[in-house]
Interface confidence: low
């Protein structure tokens, strides 16, 4: 339906409020580096012009595109050229050039400083001083930093944070109160934007038709009773959803989100019996609520898929006459009898069938050729059941940090190109698979491990596609978006790999180490590890367990001393000396 | 855009008092978070005190809580720094700042406009 001025339908669909917050979170995701202040010069700017088109949709400007307009503003930027370099170079672009250029220059790994969470007494006061303000900065600050986070869904976190300091600002003990709060909002973010960088990855270099297909598989495991027409409707809908928010269409996105729920919560009965509660709430925790709703419970009546898509004789003409439909159809009918497979591993077994079909209906006896399809699946399903009943046992017997320095040296050993701050990320969040995943029964084990997995090495895809260094990740990154997982799996050790040169630098620590947090110092002796095996990428798991032992307890040793900082310059050569040999370096 | 001059700093003996002002022209202050940093030679930029826009919130670093006292007055546009039982390691330049969307008060890059400090010497 066309409206005389976009902007004015979408201010009024949407209110001020979000309308405002949308604006920001999608300049902050575009101009990453521009200060706060400007970011709100332009927003307060852009909002006035939506007022104006809200009271006249035929004023002046009011039936430009919204892209249009919002890039018209983006390059009123003074210090465009200066701050950005090359991607003022889009403004002389025409759109919708324009915006994809603006796309393509999205940092997934800004140069920002670390976010440092004040005292709680700091945040309290800026909260109370100026509660519009510290919430536009907490927008701004996650946008810029994360410039795919799901836009509405940054709505729903902001209005959780807005909750947290109400309601803590006042408590007896304040920090007691806000500070979990904050570290869960800070964690579930951290989660929520890895998740939606996968929906666009897939969208963007993988095209529409595999994000359907990965959203066929998710939604008919999520609503096994709902028919695959409807199921193909909320797909269809989805994707212009995600299409719409990758795509840096911000306010189309949230305003087609909240009719999707809409029309779920009015249709409930014939999606799933798991709605209703979801349903009662308001539209931010509605929607938020729906995207996580547990799967319903399966029709205890389903037949064997095989009757329709083995044995029928109908089954070259069923493919010829739609193909897409009938992969669609085969996916749902699987996944919805399979909440305990991945969707990746779903997403492989469809591909195998679409193979077999591409070559048996091309065959003299068709029937014959793909009679057993079924049995290609084994090995598939296999896989991953082996490979996490082994790393969950590895999990169980390490514990977490251990398990995440094994998985360092794994992944150094692969791809020792990689820098090291991307190993030491991708590996700590690989390693937390264990325990998130491990403790499930083994019939949620592979949907919450593999699926995870994905998600934590399209981190590594993004990140290292911004500066490639490893042909072989690149492979793994862009040959086949199911295969990821599998084909970094399979990697060996990098044979062709020139180790590091050693540099004692490296390996000199000082009494700072003792201050930091828990997790700070895994980091740091965790950095130390990745750097260790890249000068030595040979060294038996032994070899690094005793280096590693023996770091630790200089650690351990110098931060009790009286005089650290000595400790840690005279030990320090010691233990380098001492690693050097162990090492045989 | 804000100009912000510090005064006020001198040498003064262990345990003696001074008190420190920010004069801001150019922009009225109560839109603005202010700030008091101060640097030592030799060392980081740190974090001294720091007051709401409206006056009703002050926030000390550690060391010189219950010595120190920031306040405002915003019809003079003027912050002061009240600062009481000196110790030698007072020692430095002391700055202004403002910050109008400062959410972390005690982060030095919240802040838009600085002074140019001024300096207090705790010698005997």
């Known amino acids: 339906d066309a409206h005389k001025s976009e902007v004015a339908h979408r201010f009024k669909d949407l209110g001020e409020e979000n309308f405002k917050a949308l604006v920001l979170i999608a300049f902050a995701q575009y101009l990453q580096q521009c200060p706060f202040e400007d970011h709100v010069k332009l927003v307060n700017e852009v909002t006035e012009f939506a007022k104006t088109c809200v009271a006249d949709e035929s004023a002046e400007n009011c039936d430009k595109s919204l892209h249009t307009l919002f890039g018209d503003k983006l390059c009123t930027v003074a210090t465009l050229r200066e701050t950005y370099g090359e991607m003022a170079d889009c403004c002389a672009k025409q759109e919708p050039e324009r915006n994809e250029c603006f796309l393509q220059h999205k940092d997934d790994n800004p140069n920002l400083p670390r976010l440092v969470r004040p005292e709680v007494d700091v945040m309290c006061t800026a909260f109370h001083d100026n509660e519009e303000t510290f919430l536009k900065k907490y927008l701004y600050e996650i946008a810029r930093r994360h410039p795919y986070f799901y836009a509405p869904e940054l709505l729903f976190f902001a209005k959780r944070y807005k909750a947290a300091f109400t309601e803590c600002c006042q408590a007896a003990d304040k920090a007691a109160c806000l500070l979990p709060k904050l570290d869960e909002l800070r964690d579930e973010g951290k989660a929520s934007s890895a998740k939606q960088r996968l929906k666009c990855a897939s969208l963007q270099k993988f095209g529409e038709r595999a994000f359907k297909a990965w959203a066929v598989a998710r939604l008919s495991q999520r609503f096994p009773k709902a028919e695959f027409a409807e199921v193909s409707k909320l797909v269809t809908d989805l994707t212009k959803v995600h299409t719409e928010c990758c795509h840096g269409d911000l306010l189309e996105c949230a305003d087609d989100r909240a009719d999707l729920a809409k029309y779920i919560c009015e249709n409930q009965d014939s999606i799933s019996s798991k709605l209703k509660e979801c349903c009662e709430k308001p539209l931010l925790e509605k929607s938020h609520c729906i995207a996580e709703v547990e799967n319903d419970e399966m029709p205890a009546d389903l037949p064997s898929l095989a009757a329709d898509f083995v044995e029928s004789k109908d089954v070259c003409k069923n493919y010829a006459e739609a193909k897409d439909v009938f992969l669609g159809m085969f996916l749902y009918e699987y996944a919805r009898r399979h909440p305990d497979y991945s969707v990746v591993l779903l997403l492989r077994l469809a591909k195998t069938y679409e193979t077999t079909l591409e070559k048996c209906c091309a065959a003299a006896d068709p029937h014959e050729c793909y009679a057993k399809v079924f049995d290609e699946f084994k090995p598939l399903v296999e896989e991953p059941q082996n490979l996490i009943k082994q790393n969950c046992e590895l999990f169980e017997q390490l514990g977490e940090y251990k398990f995440q320095n094994a998985l360092l040296v794994r992944y150094t050993k692969k791809v020792p190109q990689v820098s090291t701050p991307t190993l030491v990320e991708v590996s700590r969040n690989l390693g937390k698979v264990g325990s998130k995943c491990c403790k499930h029964p083994e019939a949620k084990r592979m949907p919450c491990a593999e699926d995870y997995l994905s998600v934590v090495l399209n981190q590594l895809c993004v990140l290292h596609e911004k500066t490639p260094v490893s042909d072989r990740v690149t492979k793994c990154c862009t040959e086949s978006l199911v295969n990821r997982r599998p084909c970094f799996s399979a990697l060996e050790v990098d044979e062709t790999y020139v180790p590091k040169e050693f540099n004692a630098e490296t390996f000199t620590f000082h009494a700072d180490i003792c201050t930091l947090s828990e997790k700070e110092r895994q980091i740091k002796k965790q950095t130390a590890l990745v750097e260790l095996v890249k000068h030595k990428p040979k060294a038996t798991k032994e070899q690094l367990k005793a280096v590693m032992d023996d770091f630790a307890a200089f650690v351990e040793k110098c931060c009790k001393a009286d005089d650290k900082e000595t400790c840690f310059a005279e030990e320090g050569k010691k233990l380098v000396a001492a690693s050097q040999a162990a090492l045989g370096l | 855009d804000v100009q912000l001059v510090e005064s006020g700093g001198g040498v003064v003996q262990p345990g003696g008092s001074l008190r420190l002002s920010c004069a801001a022209s150019g922009s009225t202050i109560s839109s603005y978070v202010m700030g008091w940093f101060r640097q030592a030679p030799g060392k980081e930029r740190e974090f001294v005190a720091a007051i709401s826009r409206s006056g009703g919130y002050t926030y000390y670093a550690d060391s010189v809580k219950g010595r120190f006292t920031i306040s405002r007055d915003n019809s003079k546009n003027t912050v002061y720094l009240q600062m009481n039982s000196l110790r030698p390691e007072d020692t430095a330049l002391y700055y202004c700042?403002?910050?109008?969307?400062?959410?972390?008060?005690?982060?030095?890059?919240?802040?838009?406009?600085w002074g140019q400090g001024t300096l207090v010497t705790v010698s005997s």
């Open positions: 700042a403002a910050g109008r969307y400062s959410a972390w008060y005690s982060q030095s890059y919240e802040y838009d406009y």
